[in-house]
């Protein structure tokens, strides 16, 4: 059987022969020489030669246990001659001995961390780890302790765990944000002889809102016209505060004063300023100047540094309205007149009034737009502001005139306004009645008495208050022995009625119909129309069959006998 | 280069004796055991025995146990086998090899021996 | 004493194929994972020439389309692809126990 124990080499060794690990034996070895001790496995016949008689293995070259602390290697005892193992093959281990010769290395060269400011002493920043590449299992090489070289009285570090704290109160990022720390980690316990490694921690303090917002004046002024639209912006304020990002995020609002419903304060984002601007039409004429309390707070707000005050400031703004030269108002925002469409020339429809709002009250001049006006129907007085008619009207032509006035300021023309005027044109019965359409109808030859041949239907261009009444009749030079009779239905509608039983369309083959048609209104109006009867040829049920043609064609010659 | 040079061709009468002699060089001849084989004509290798230069210690296969004697001289990195009692069955060419963990890793060019009346 | 069979005694086979010798043993030469068995190439008027050692290990300088197999009794030689200068007579031997035996050869031919 094989005779070794496990083997131990020192690392790092410096001598100048080959450093002696130990001796493979097999108690079949008779010590003649007939046995050869072979190697194999980790760094055979490179780190480790054997004596291939003896079994002596030597390690050729200086070993450095954190490179690898183990090998494992095989060993085997075979006769010479035969080539037969005397014994099986066999794993052994040659454990590399440690030596303090690893300083501890931090994982990173430079640390960065963050705190916030104010935070209370014992506050976790970061925790640094140094490694030591020595054996942790075999004395103090890899035992590690740590220490603050640089970043005191601010800052400290936890021995064993590396893990660094706040060490003062009160550290203000508004008096100083950066902090450079160097921590040290030593072997050996941190005892005497033992090795170091050092990192840099560039530590920021992080802001909290610990500030509140300032006002560097307690007082502004802004002048604004007085024709600034609402939305218009007329100043900038601004309050500055000491943190940052969201801490000095600053929020405007008019708290007090003669302007609050007159004026608005918005934040700008991005400048952190408020923003004046205009919320309602202003009037020089009513009032020259406003005041405003406006305050800028913090939005968001720290409890736990309430103690220091409140986290709000404001400030007095005076703004000027200044006088502007406007133009003419008009009293109404539109007039809307009437007039009868019989009306005469120069006939005064109404009037309209403006006024130059300033001080000064300017005299005013009005004119009609001609471009609203191109067939110079009205007119109007330059002085007064009355309107009349240039020319004659008529409802049933436009009923609706709308036209523009001018009112211009006549010490500075460049000052006008425009009102709209919508004027109605009323109606008047000046149009007759006449028929719907024009009407040809027929009758049969052997139409009987009283029979309805056509109905009548009537229109009038008036358009009178209480609705069209139209009235039906024969025309006096035919009322008289005539073959038909006109019934007036009393719905504005009449009926043709035949007057005897047959007709005979070789005596009479067409007859024509005088009506007239007369409106209820004043004065009345009324019109003749002419119906066209012609005699045809009917089958038993009443149907047209033929009639004479040319009495369509031919009208002329044709009795008027009906 | 390891080498292994072997004397020459032998021609001898039955009974008599000869002595085949292995020159090894480019190695340590007291390193490895020295083996000698022999091939009759036409037919395959057949193991002799061998020698550990160092200690003289010899092994010989039964067949040949009483006639063949090998030895070696240190001082010339030399191996010899003698054969004696010759018949016509020991013609042969006789190979001497230089045993390494049971093989034959290096051989000599052979020296024929003829056996005839 | 160790009889060793090889076989076939011949055979012949066209370049490019792949050729199989076996060789058994009488009785196992294989101890503790070694199989001390050993292969030889021999051409004409030529001394033999070490191939393989230990079953399966390729001596030092021969092409690597010689490979061996096998433990205890049972052991193959193989050539993966012949080539015209592998003509030769192969042989087995071991050194398990004295006395130290060959196989009777295998004869390769060319086709």
């Known amino acids: 059987s094989w005779m070794w124990n496990q083997f131990f080499l020192l690392e790092e060794y410096t001598g100048s022969d080959y450093q002696y690990v130990g001796k493979l034996h097999s108690d079949q070895d008779r010590g003649d020489g007939s046995l050869k001790y072979i190697l194999s496995g980790d760094g055979a016949g490179d780190l480790f030669i054997i004596n291939e008689n003896t079994g002596d293995i030597q390690a050729t070259k200086r070993l450095d246990r954190e490179e690898k602390p183990v090998y494992i290697l095989r060993a085997q005892a075979i006769n010479r001659r035969t080539g037969r193992p005397v014994e099986p093959e066999s794993e052994f281990i040659i454990k590399i001995h440690d030596i303090n010769d690893n300083e501890p290395i931090f994982t990173k060269e430079v640390y960065t961390a963050t705190v916030p400011e104010m935070s209370d002493v014992g506050t976790f920043v970061v925790q640094v780890t140094a490694t030591d590449a020595d054996d942790p299992t075999y004395g103090n090489s890899a035992k590690v302790v740590y220490s603050i070289l640089q970043g005191q009285p601010y800052f400290s570090v936890e021995s064993e765990t590396g893990i660094i704290k706040t060490a003062l109160l009160n550290m203000d990022r508004e008096n100083r944000e950066q902090y450079q720390v160097v921590i040290q980690a030593k072997d050996m316990g941190g005892q005497m002889g033992g090795l170091s490694g050092t990192t840099t921690v560039n530590i920021t303090l992080t802001d909290v809102n610990d500030n509140p917002p300032r006002f560097p004046q307690s007082t502004y002024q802004f002048k604004t016209p007085e024709s600034s639209p609402p939305g218009t912006p007329i100043g900038r304020i601004k309050a500055s505060d000491a943190d940052v990002g969201e801490n000095a995020e600053i929020e405007y609002s008019i708290t007090d004063g003669e302007g609050l419903d007159m004026f608005d304060v918005i934040t700008d984002q991005e400048t952190q300023e408020g923003i004046i601007t205009v919320k309602k039409l202003l009037d020089f004429e009513k009032k020259k100047v406003y005041t405003l309390k406006v305050e800028a707070s913090n939005p968001y707000v720290e409890p736990r540094f309430l103690y220091l005050g409140p986290f709000k400031d404001s400030a007095t703004v005076r703004i000027v309205v200044e006088d502007v030269d406007e133009p003419p108002v008009f009293s109404k925002l539109a007039y809307i007149l009437q007039i009868r469409e019989d009306a005469q020339i120069n006939t005064t429809i109404g009037s309209v009034t403006a006024q130059d709002p300033d001080a000064a009250r300017n005299p005013v001049k009005y004119s009609v737009d001609r471009h609203t006006d191109m067939d110079r129907i009205f007119n109007i007085d330059s002085g007064n502001g009355s309107i009349f008619t240039s020319k004659l009207l008529d409802r049933e032509t436009l009923l609706w005139h709308n036209i523009t006035v001018i009112a211009t300021e006549i010490n500075n023309p460049k000052q006008s306004s425009r009102v709209p005027l919508y004027i109605k044109v009323l109606d008047v019965n000046d149009n007759a009645p006449e028929f719907a359409e024009f009407y040809e109808t027929f009758v049969c030859e052997k139409a009987k008495a009283d029979q309805l041949i056509q109905t009548l239907h009537a229109v009038d261009k008036d358009d009178p208050y209480s609705g069209h009444q139209f009235s039906f009749s024969l025309a006096p030079e035919a009322a008289s022995g005539s073959n038909f009779t006109i019934q007036d239905n009393k719905d504005n509608t009449a009926g043709i009625l035949t007057r005897k039983n047959g007709y005979n369309r070789h005596e009479m083959s067409t007859y024509l119909l005088p009506v007239v048609i007369s409106d209820n209104d004043y004065p009345v109006q009324s019109s003749t129309g002419t119906v066209t009867v012609r005699v045809c040829a009917c089958d038993h049920h009443g149907n047209m069959q033929s009639c004479h043609a040319e009495a369509l064609i031919h009208p002329t010659g044709l009795s008027t006998g009906a | 280069e390891v080498q292994l040079v072997q004397s020459g061709a032998e021609v001898k009468k039955p009974g008599s004796s000869v002595k085949v002699s292995c020159k090894a060089s480019g190695y340590t001849f007291t390193n490895y055991w020295m083996h000698w084989v022999r091939q009759r004509p036409g037919q395959g290798l057949e193991w002799m025995g061998d020698i550990d230069p160092s200690h003289s210690e010899t092994h010989y296969t039964q067949k040949f146990k009483d006639r063949v004697t090998i030895t070696v001289d240190k001082s010339t990195s030399t191996a010899y086998m003698e054969l004696s009692s010759l018949r016509s069955e020991d013609t042969a060419v006789y190979y001497c090899a230089r045993g390494d963990l049971g093989r034959f890793d290096y051989w000599g060019q052979g020296t024929t021996v003829t056996v005839s009346s | 004493d160790i009889q060793m069979t090889q076989s076939p005694s011949s055979l012949s086979a066209s370049v490019g194929d792949r050729v199989t010798i076996t060789c058994r043993a009488s009785e196992s030469v294989s101890i503790h994972g070694t199989h001390l068995m050993h292969w030889y190439q021999q051409k004409p008027g030529k001394p033999p020439k070490l191939l393989i050692y230990a079953a399966s290990n390729l001596e030092s300088g021969v092409p690597s389309r010689f490979s061996g197999s096998g433990s205890e009794t049972d052991f193959t030689f193989t050539i993966s692809s012949l080539q015209p200068e592998d003509i030769a007579t192969y042989y087995c031997?071991?050194?398990?126990?004295?006395?130290?035996?060959f196989g009777g050869g295998t004869k390769v031919e060319i086709k």
């Open positions: 031997q071991q050194s398990f126990e004295d006395p130290w035996t």
